[in-house]
Amino acid sequence: MAVTACQGLGFVVSLIGIAGIIAATCMDQWSTQDLYNNPVTAVFNYQGLWRSCVRESSGFTECRGYFTLLGLPAMLQAVRALMIVGIVLGAIGLLVSIFALKCIRIGSMEDSAKANMTLTSGIMFIVSGLCAIAGVSVFANMLVTNFWMSTANMYTGMGGMVQTVQTRYTFGAALFVGWVAGGLTLIGGVMMCIACRGLAPEETNYKAVSYHASGHSVAYKPGGFKASTGFGSNTKNKKIYDGGARTEDEVQSYPSKHDYV
């Protein structure tokens, strides 16, 4: 039960995280005009990975896409790449994890296969989350560097008389969305990896021996774990004891008089 819950929760957390990564990637507010210690302007500038926007106080907003590829800074291209890789890995991870969920029965898929798929999706989520966090962090670092550079020459004097307003940019909402989303995807991935361990416990090395107690038919099968779905044809709720460790995720079988090894 705990394994199923962990797996399900991991899936949900990762799903929210990946939705957040997609949202962050599409958002226009990666960097926003810094309003502190700046002349108050009647326009507000903000920029995303794909376009830059200007919102006039009068209510009009105009956005222009970056229609060049080669003219863009390498760092911006790197951030785009990281976010897209994160989304792609996350999407594949989600697809894999859907089939890996214990609560979903797909034919006669064994627990070992589900465990492998859970681990695969978990790793994908972890890498996806790391990509998003890395992408957002690279962009944030770029902003900080540019911020202090523009602060150093806040006003560019021209002829000693005329002043040019330097627009400084600070962290936009998308950065925080990206960090949180990346973190959630990472946590979801870790949870999937933990769930994978519960789905496929390690086999013990001692030989399986079956004892018949008089009057009671209870099979003792140490180390006799067989990976399978919880949805086999035999779903009678009998107990099996595996080397003293009880697992709820195994296929139950009736003891018979031929159970001796």
């Epitope: 009647a42 903000y46 200007v54």
Partner: antibody
């Protein structure tokens, strides 16, 4: 069709307060702002202040202590209040709607205010 | 505050003549975000409310005749009337629509001979 109409007292005594109402139609005050401009007789235009759709206000720095702009979105009205009037506050007061480029694309016909005892 | 300086303060021209008037601002009105200059030109005829002619320094308002042209960038701007008509007799104002307070220039009065 966008329209703005100012209504004021016409004559105000010095040191008193001036209250002018700008009633708008054809656009919503929740989305668009309203600017106030005045013009003393025979002189140029002087920007007084603005109230934007989100309710934020900005004022002429020399008049900030005497000016206040507020609005009633439901009644489509914007109010300009000028305190401690002096004779040089005698002017025609205009309200206008800022559009693209924050430029005032629509203006009221103006209301003439004389400050005199 | 940004100081807007218009020159000349008055112009006397004959119909059909080309006219240029200048507007200078003490700070740049160029917004780096969209590379647009937030300078506006208004026309005010005697006894009337001002009328918007040009915004973003060079974009004509709809319904404004194409003989009116705005140009310039940063701090230096120009309004040109390619062929002055009798109905163009008015005062022309420039306004900073970028940095608060949104100050006006002193105006250029256009008179006909």
């Amino acid at each position: 069709q966008v329209q703005l109409k100012e209504s004021g007292p016409g004559l105000v005594a010095p040191s008193q307060s001036l209250a002018i109402t700008c009633t708008v139609s054809g656009f919503s005050l929740t989305t668009y702002g309203v600017s106030w401009v005045r013009q003393p007789p025979g002189k140029g235009l002087e920007w007084l202040g603005v109230i934007w759709g989100d309710g934020s206000t900005h004022y002429h720095s020399a008049l900030i202590s005497r000016l206040s702009i507020r609005k009633d979105n439901s009644k489509s009205q914007v109010f300009l209040k000028v305190n401690s009037l002096q004779t040089d506050d005698t002017a025609t007061y205009y309200c206008g709607k800022p559009g693209r480029g924050n430029a005032m694309d629509y203006w009221g016909q103006g209301t003439s205010v004389t400050v005199s005892s | 505050d940004i100081v807007m300086t218009q020159s000349p303060s008055s112009l006397t021209v004959t119909a059909g003549e080309k006219v240029t008037m200048s507007c200078k601002s003490s700070q740049s009105l160029l917004n780096s975000g969209n590379q647009k200059n937030y300078l506006t030109w208004y026309q005010q005829k005697p006894g009337q409310s001002p009328k918007l002619l040009i915004y973003w320094a060079s974009t004509r308002e709809s319904g404004v005749p194409d003989r009116f042209t705005g140009s310039g960038s940063g701090t230096d701007f120009t309004l040109t009337i390619s062929s002055v008509q009798a109905e163009d007799l008015a005062v022309y104002y420039c306004q900073n629509d970028y940095i608060y307070p949104l100050t006006f220039g002193g105006g250029t009065t256009l008179e006909l001979k």
